[in-house]
Interface confidence: medium
């Protein structure tokens, strides 16, 4: 901790400006008023302070706001945000999407840090649900964000937010997460015509039940093998050879290359050999 020392004569900072970069740590502690710092936080980012100097400024804010910073200060933290610990952030009440964006911008291009994860958690909990604008913002900064949430957290995503989800946002989702998201997507896209509906719902099909796959097989959709391989094994097993043939269309020949992998392997073992032979692919049950 920086020692408490009196500010030398004539050194009291009337405002936050470039001259402060020449102050030693103890001078910053003694000569910069914490309330002044709080009201002029937006200037700090434009000044090339050292990490040690930023530590002093953070310490001053901590003393001024022991219960947590107000949002007016949080919004202008800039690079000082990188100095915050998850414990600091848990004290905050962040409600503005603009504040969230400002802080995510500071961390842009890096992996999601514990600080950012805590910030997002505080923000989403404060809002009560993962609304569309929040989801838009978070997936823009972290395309894999959605798949980092637990099924319980995903249950707070309203169907209207599903329109914000892009195919790449679901790349790392596991079946438990897709189980939650699929019914929401089905509801969100229900008014679309057949071919557009299929392309929109495709990324979510890892959560689809057997009856929905059977229905899709009647719609001439030509599902690609990459999508088929992500389907739930328990949803695929009850499908007949004819249904899989209709579901995959011209992609059905790709089953041969995947015959040793789930869910294809398990599905093949459930079929009658006579039925498999109708595909002409040499699949052995």
């Amino acid at each position: 901790e920086v020692e408490k020392t009196a500010c030398p004569s004539g050194k009291k900072a009337p405002e936050i400006d470039e001259s402060l970069i020449f102050y030693k740590k103890w001078e910053l502690e003694a000569c910069v008023d914490a309330a002044l710092l709080a009201t002029q936080m937006d200037r700090v980012n434009a000044i090339p302070f050292t990490y040690e100097q930023l530590d002093v400024l953070k310490h001053k804010l901590d003393e001024l706001y022991p219960q947590g910073y107000p949002e007016s200060v949080i919004q202008h933290l800039g690079y000082l945000f990188l100095k915050m610990s998850p414990e600091d952030i848990r004290k905050w009440n962040v409600t503005s999407l603009e504040t969230l964006k400002a802080l995510l911008e500071v961390n842009k291009g890096h992996e999601m840090s514990p600080q950012v994860a805590t910030l997002i958690d505080r923000f989403v909990k404060g809002r009560g649900q993962l609304d569309k604008d929040t989801l838009d913002t978070l997936t823009a900064f972290y395309p894999g964000y959605l798949c980092s949430l637990s099924p319980e957290e995903l249950s707070s995503v309203p169907p209207s937010s599903i329109w914000a989800v892009r195919p790449q946002d679901l790349d790392t989702c596991d079946p438990r997460q897709l189980d939650v998201l699929y019914p929401k997507a089905r509801l969100a896209f229900q008014n679309m015509n057949g071919s557009e509906y299929f392309v929109k719902i495709q990324s979510f099909l890892g959560g689809a039940p057997t009856e929905d796959l059977k229905a899709l097989s009647q719609q001439n959709v030509s599902m690609d093998l990459a999508t088929f391989m992500k389907l739930r094994t328990d949803a695929v097993l009850p499908l007949t050879v004819a249904e899989v043939q209709k579901l995959l269309g011209p992609h059905v020949e790709g089953l041969k290359a995947e015959e040793r992998h789930r869910p294809v392997r398990d599905w093949i073992l459930r079929q009658r050999q006579d039925d498999l032979d109708t595909l002409g692919l040499g699949l052995q049950g």
């Epitope: 329109w163 195919p167 008014n191 679309m192 392309v199 929109k200």
Partner: antibody, heavy 116, light 108 residues
Framework: QVQLQQSGAELMKPGASVKLSCKAT????????IEWVKQRPGHGLEWIGE????????NYNEKFKGKATFTADTSSNTAYMQLSSLTTEDSAIYYC?????????WGQGTLVTVSA | QIVLTQSPAIMSASLGERVTMTCTAS???????LHWYQQKPGSSPKLWTY???NLASGVPARFSGSGSGTSYSLTISSMEAEDAATYYC?????????FGGGTKLEIK
């Protein structure tokens, strides 16, 4: 049937702003993205950004952030794009399109000419 | 962002000739999200094929699309006069959405 009707041609001075409109009919306006696309004479198609009228949610091509602003009025089923601080580089045809899984329907385009 | 490169930029074909144009992506695009549009002078673009190989409503059967990953193509089995136009490929997979530079197809 689905139709997107865009506002008429605009002749603007450099530095001015212009607001283009795109009126949608024949489908549920709130349930599809409205995309905006720029085409300069003799050039290809360039995606500007999109708005989902149901929520007002927007996504912008980084290149057009600060240049284009999207809004939508669900009572009149109309999407708007405002272009600010116009320069001669903004002279182009601007299209709106409806997107579900692709840009299935396009407006007729609005020609914006920026000239001193 | 995904850059789509179309080749050739301009091509001419005789009536009845087989025509193929290509679209190469800078990184992999799911075939479900790769589409082609046709544009004629003075008109808006029209959806021509969707999800790589599906013909949009009203598109003649002489057109076909194929491809996967980073390589896609649009083929006309037998060129007709009305096919003269500019064709754009488009990816709707990863934002920002991008278009190829276009292939202008003329009659020889």
């Amino acid at each position: 049937q689905v139709q997107l009707q865009q506002s008429g041609a605009e002749l603007m001075k450099p530095g001015a702003s212009v607001k283009l409109s795109c009126k949608a009919t024949g489908y549920t306006f709130t349930g599809y993205w409205i995309e905006w696309v720029k085409q300069r004479p003799g050039h290809g198609l360039e995606w500007i950004g999109e708005i989902l009228p149901g929520s007002g949610s927007t996504n912008y091509n980084e290149k057009f952030k600060g240049k284009a602003t999207f809004t939508a009025d669900t009572s009149s089923n109309t999407a708007y794009m405002q272009l600010s601080s116009l320069t001669t580089e903004d002279s182009a045809i601007y299209y709106c399109a409806r997107a579900g899984a692709w840009f299935a329907y396009w407006g007729q385009g609005t020609l914006v000419t920026v000239s001193a | 962002q995904i850059v789509l490169t179309q080749s050739p930029a301009i091509m001419s074909a005789s009536l009845g000739e087989r025509v193929t144009m290509t679209c190469t992506a800078s990184s992999s695009v799911s075939s479900s999200y790769l589409h082609w549009y046709q544009q004629k002078p003075g008109s808006s673009p029209k959806l021509w094929t969707y999800s790589t190989s599906n013909l949009a409503s009203g598109v003649p059967a002489r057109f076909s699309g194929s491809g996967s990953g980073t390589s896609y193509s649009l083929t006309i089995s037998s060129m007709e006069a009305e096919d003269a136009a500019t064709y754009y490929c488009h990816q709707y997979h990863r934002s920002p959405w991008t278009f190829g530079g276009g292939t202008k197809l003329e009659i020889k």
